[in-house]
């Protein structure tokens, strides 16, 4: 019979022969032959392989280094890598999450549009007319100006994007 030029899924071509790939969590020890099956070996502790493969070495689990602000989000298995995330108040600097930086705070005049997560930074937005923020914060949204009318008061000092309005009593001298 003609030697194959392509193999089925979960197989690979070697020496004109289709051999079974090793399943996730195992690595290749020796290719199959005409008389023997592919020989695979389980990954050891702290190692993994996450695909059907013909790798001769398992990969080492990622270490979530606390010195870089990292912590374990999900422990690795023989078939999955460890997933790192950042400590409270920090977020990853990249998709691979190899280190963390402190969440950005929104300056006065800006409010938090989206609170930061372990993988994304704070998103700030300028406070629109009618709203203000007088603090630098990673959590505070823009607050609406106080409504003087609902308190039977009048505006004594206009609000800005950084300050609330100042309310005062009605001018009783008016007829």
């Amino acid at each position: 019979p003609e030697p194959p030029t392509a193999c089925r899924e979960k197989q690979y071509l070697i020496n004109s022969q289709c051999c079974s790939l090793c399943q996730p969590g195992q690595k290749l020890v020796s290719d199959c032959t005409e008389f023997t099956e592919t020989e695979c070996l389980p990954c050891g502790e702290s190692e993994f392989l996450d695909t059907w493969n013909r790798e001769t070495h398992c990969h080492q689990h990622k270490y979530c280094d606390p010195n870089l602000g990292l912590r374990v989000q999900q422990k690795g298995t023989s078939e999955t890598d460890t997933i790192c995330t950042c400590e409270e108040g920090w977020h990853c600097t990249s998709e691979a999450c190899e280190s963390c930086v402190l969440h950005r705070s929104c300056s006065p005049g800006f409010g938090v549009k989206q609170i930061a997560t372990g993988v994304s930074d704070t998103i700030c937005e300028p406070c629109p007319v009618g709203f203000f923020s007088n603090v630098s914060s990673a959590f505070e949204k823009c607050h609406p100006w106080t409504s003087c009318e609902t308190k039977d008061l009048v505006v004594q000092q206009a609000g800005t994007n950084k300050t609330d309005v100042v309310c005062g009593p009605q001018d009783r001298l008016r007829a």
């Epitope: 070996l41 502790e45 702290s46 190692e47 080492q60 270490y63 280094d65 912590r71 422990k75």
Partner: antibody, heavy 118, light 106 residues
Framework: EVQLVQSGAEVKKPGATVKISCKVS????????IHWVQQAPGKGLEWMGR????????KYDPKFQGRVTMTADTSTDTAYMELSSLRSEDTAVYYC???????????WGQGTTVTVSS | QIVLTQSPTIMSASPGEKVIITCSAT?????ILWFQQKPGTSPKLWIY???NLASGVPARFSGSGSGASYSLTISRMEAEDAATYYC?????????FGGGTKLEIK
């Protein structure tokens, strides 16, 4: 800084039970396996077993199976190893240690000496 | 269970001499760890994943091997290398250690 601090030396009578603690700092105990290793005087290292503190899953060497119990308290980041029905040959130093790749140091405790004597 | 046999059990080497310690398993394992222990102290991780040096280990040390045959090599022996070295496999339960190799300085 990662540290594993073990409880102090113990002297026990044959048939008694000893419980050794291993307090970790510098990492979350539930994130990595804790292994326990025995070393009798003048002898080599013997792996006793390991615990996954996250779910309490344990694996023991058959040599110690039935006499050893490994537990962990994630609220205090402390692992425990209890050895029962002690005999003179259990006189040894007992070590706790982490998964090898923790900071590529594979940290070890300072060891706890257990003496079994009548 | 996997039995690890270290060879030699005891040896002495002169400063500057090349040292090779072997660790042979009764069947294939994924990797070997090597630990160094000096009297009265806890063991220290020395080589992980067969060939990676642990933090702080001098570059004169190296590890190699695959399957059932592994080795630790010191390119040039130094006095501070005198210690007992243990190999360990963490592929199959129960995890096992080799019997140790005591390395002395001549």
């Amino acid at each position: 800084e990662v540290q594993l601090v073990q409880s102090g030396a113990e002297v026990k009578k044959p048939g008694a039970t000893v419980k050794i603690s291993c307090k970790v700092s510098g990492f979350n105990i539930k994130d990595y396996y804790i292994h326990w290793v025995q070393q009798a005087p003048g002898k080599g290292l013997e792996w006793m077993g390991r615990i996954d503190p996250e779910d309490g899953d344990t694996k023991y060497d058959p040599k110690f199976q039935g006499r050893v119990t490994m537990t962990a308290d994630t609220s205090t980041d402390t692992a425990y190893m209890e050895l029962s029905s002690l005999r003179s040959e259990d006189t040894a130093v007992y070590y706790c240690t982490t998964s090898y790749y923790v900071g590529t140091y594979g940290y070890w405790g300072q060891g706890t000496t257990v003496t079994v004597s009548s | 269970q996997i039995v690890l046999t270290q060879s030699p059990t005891i040896m002495s080497a002169s400063p500057g001499e090349k040292v090779i310690i072997t660790c042979s398993a009764t069947s294939s394992v994924s990797y070997i760890l090597w630990f160094q222990q000096k009297p009265g102290t806890s063991p220290k991780l020395w080589i992980y994943s067969t060939s990676n040096l642990a933090s702080g280990v001098p570059a004169r040390f190296s590890g190699s091997g695959s399957g059932a045959s592994y080795s630790l090599t010191i390119s040039r022996m130094e006095a501070e290398d005198a210690a007992t070295y243990y190999c360990q496999q963490r592929t199959f339960y129960p995890y096992t250690f080799g019997g140790g190799t005591k390395l002395e300085i001549k």
